[in-house]
Interface confidence: low
Amino acid sequence: EELQVIQPDKSVLVAAGETATLRCTATSLIPVGPIQWFRGAGPGRELIYNQKEGHFPRVTTVSDLTKRNNMDFSIRIGNITPADAGTYYCVKFRKGSPDDVEFKSGAGTELSVRAKPSPPEVSGPADRGIPDQKVNFTCKSHGFSPRNITLKWFKDGQELHPLETTVNPSGKNVSYNISSTVRVVLNSMDVNSKVICEVAHITLDRSPLRGIANLSNFIRVSPTVKVTQQSPTSMNQVNLTCRAERFYPEDLQLIWLENGNVSRNDTPKNLTKNTDGTYNYTSLFLVNSSAHREDVVFTCQVKHDQQPAITRNHTVLGFAHSSDQGSMQTFPDNNATHNWN
């Protein structure tokens, strides 16, 4: 009976890093000649193991191929990576001169590699968004096999529906990549919020991988700015307060102007933090009434996170308007930049 090359396993599934055993037996000792293992068929096939010559550090034979009556040509390939996936053929050669001649091939064993996805990476917009703005986040994970994978988005524990999720390549490959995009509507309470991308795969058991984006890195909450007058501490003094409330991030510059001229430059040090993650800042400005006979427009100018300045004016009437020489009247103008005289 003519020699047959038997590869009993149609397919083998191995986890990355483990050892794959590819089984092969021959039904006869005749004809005499070596066995070679190849990945793939045809002229482009790759030599994996050659019984006759060469050294194959990752390949070991299951049985002793030097024994005369050996008909087991199974091999083990160590430290499997996704790049090892493919169909492996056990091929019997007949001794020839000058070269051995291919005699018979096994049916092939498909080696599939289980590889874990990389930890998901979540990226967001380059510029900060503002409340009510829609911003996109992208989650990417790569290097997994097989292709089946589940990706979910969450914001503060609530599942979000992605705009688009793609697994590439679409055809058969040694490993795969996933990319998903979700749209989030920002709100002013999002400074403490997180967007989470969760990837589940057969290689991860019941422990999905998570990628996290802190919305604090992607949101800008502009301050509300108010100028108020405190009760006078003495006959010839007025206390003005400029309050910037509920802003994020903390980058803030505050300038006091008198009639349009810079009077004081604040670089806030002691910000107070609100429970929602935003900040408040209060700046006090002492006005000396004896120095002002005419009306003076005091301006609080707030620059937040390199955005255009927010301006609030407050007019203080000078001595010329006052029947009582010891007092000063003030007119706030918190909503406009023009003077109220």
């Epitope: 050659n50 010559e53 060469g54 050294h55 194959f56 550090p57 990752r58 430290n79 790049a83 090892d84």
Partner: antibody, heavy 123, light 107 residues
């Protein structure tokens, strides 16, 4: 028996080009990747990269990207190393050496070596 | 890059002695390690692959051992033809890298 035979010693001036050959015999040339290794006087052996003898695709180590080129003449079972715009620091002995299949980079133990080609770059 | 350290540049021995050449990898290379012997004016000769497997024709007085980061080439019953330089090389990760070599000389 398996042999890798390299071309003879070379003396070149800076800025010139040199092409070193490595002829393989005794085995199936396209079954094994061909690597190049540099041994400068008093320095550690340095792997330059390899060429896939089946597809002709070269892979270069970072330090050897740019002026260095691997090529093949498959019909003659010969691999070549060309170095352009020679510099004094290219003075060294260059070895060709084979590794088993190239289906994965793990197969990087060099079982057979050429005798080496001495290159001297001097003005 | 993975750095292969052969801490001893020279080792003195006598004929018939047993000597151990060590090699340390800067990170785990599994058993993807080879040993080579080089004599002056010659090309390196392959001795060991996969940390402990001898190439065909290499005398059994040469033994390789180790895995991970620490490797040893042991020569028992040193012969005069063993006086040479010995290099280790990792092939776990690109770029493939060599140790600086250990020269075996007579006491």
């Amino acid at each position: 028996q398996i042999q890798l035979v390299q071309s003879g010693p070379e003396l070149r001036k800076p800025g010139e080009t040199v092409k070193i050959s490595c002829k393989a015999s005794g085995y199936s040339f396209t079954n094994y990747a061909m690597n190049w290794v540099k041994q400068a006087p008093g320095k550690v052996l340095k792997w330059m990269g390899f060429i896939n003898t089946y597809t002709g695709e070269p892979t270069y180590a970072d330090d050897f990207k740019g002026r260095f080129a691997f090529s093949l003449e498959t019909s003659a079972s010969t691999a070549y190393l060309q170095i352009n715009n020679l510099k004094n620091e290219d003075t060294a002995t260059y070895f060709c050496t084979r590794t088993r299949g190239y289906y994965d980079f793990d197969g990087g133990a060099f079982d057979y070596w050429g005798q080496g080609t001495s290159l001297t770059v001097s003005s | 890059d993975i750095v292969m350290t052969q801490s001893q540049k020279f080792m003195s021995t006598s004929i018939g002695d047993r000597v151990s050449v060590t090699c340390k990898a800067s990170q785990n290379v599994g058993t993807h390690l080879a040993w080579y012997q080089q004599k002056p004016g010659q090309s390196p000769k392959a001795l060991i692959f996969s940390a402990s497997y001898r190439y065909i024709g290499v005398p059994d007085r040469f033994t390789g051992s180790g895995s991970g980061t620490d490797f040893t080439l042991t020569i028992t019953n040193v012969q005069s033809e063993d006086l040479a330089e010995y290099f280790c090389q990792q092939y776990n990760t690109y770029p493939l890298t060599f140790g600086a070599g250990t020269k075996l000389e007579l006491k």
